[in-house]
Amino acid sequence: QPDAINAPVTCCYNFTNRKISVQRLASYRRITSSKCPKEAVIFKTIVAKEICADPKQKWVQDSMDHLDKQTQTPKT
């Protein structure tokens, strides 16, 4: 089990101001650490680039929703 107390924390200090096409997104993770000044979502793109986004924005929520559905649907 990882040491949560000493594990390094990733925080976002600025958010992208561009909407990213869902076709370019591979995965996401939520940043809700009490060590971070802002709640955030980090999207990983299909070329492995990480982008900080504002979870309050509708396109961000829609993108997470889309990725969740992709995860739930088994690839045949």
Partner: antibody, heavy 121, light 111 residues
């Protein structure tokens, strides 16, 4: 062992004010957690009021609590909840709760026993 | 908004039986952002499960959490009389929206 204890619950008149205190022992706020206040009206469910980062002091509120309730870290072991313009609907047991670690998604593994706030004329 | 709704409000189960409690989120919260609590009268809630399916320390393996997206389930198997309590789900997806972060609760009565 790790413990939270709430204090300050009282009988207060409508439109009155009250400050609740949550005192931690067995751990320090220098280890980052979300410290939150949760209330439960008699016979009702759990309602989150506000949370504060124990390390950097970032705060979040339920929309209905904004402006009337203020969460603060007052020392390395205490968190307070200031409540103003109280109404009968604020009558509840108020719990202090701490997340399992610094992340919001791991749930509250430490709770105080609660303190009763009664608003009545 | 991430409003949590629980069903049923109350359920009766015999000792040794199985009970299933459902929790629905008003929008997707992913597959690892849900916690479950047990609360007995006069006591604070007790964390049972976090991360949708991870048992909290000291919790019996009779409790099982599952689900993803908007639909989540708590299953209690081999029910014991000590399981009589109210159970709550809680979203762990966002701290920015605290309104209705807890479900309304499900009272489990063991006969």
């Amino acid at each position: 062992q790790e413990q939270l204890v709430e204090s300050g619950g009282d009988l207060v008149k409508p439109e009155g004010s009250l400050t609740l205190t949550c005192t931690a022992s067995g751990f320090s706020f220098s280890t980052s957690y979300w410290m939150c206040w949760v209330r439960q009206a008699p016979g009702k469910g759990l309602e989150l009021i506000a949370c504060i980062s124990s390390s950097i002091g970032v705060t979040y509120y339920a929309s209905w609590a904004e402006g009337r309730f203020t969460i603060s870290k007052t020392s390395s072991t205490t968190v307070t909840l200031q409540m103003t313009s109280l109404t009968v609907a604020d009558t509840a047991t108020y719990f202090c709760a701490r997340t399992t670690d610094d992340n919001w998604n791991v749930g509250f593994n430490l709770w105080g026993p609660g303190t009763l706030v009664t608003v009545s004329s | 908004a991430y409003d949590m709704t629980q069903t049923p409000a109350s359920v009766e189960v015999g000792v040794g039986g199985t009970v299933t409690i459902k929790c629905q989120a008003s929008q997707s919260i992913g597959n690892r952002y849900l916690s479950w609590y047990q609360q007995k009268p006069g006591q604070p809630p007790k964390l049972l499960i976090y991360g949708t399916s991870t048992l909290a320390s000291g919790v019996s393996s009779r409790f099982k959490g599952s689900g993803s997206g908007t639909q989540f389930t708590l299953t209690i198997s081999g029910v014991e009389s000590a399981d009589s309590a109210t159970y709550y789900c809680q979203q762990g997806a966002t701290i920015s929206y605290l309104d209705n972060a807890f479900g309304g609760g499900t009272e489990v009565v063991v006969k």
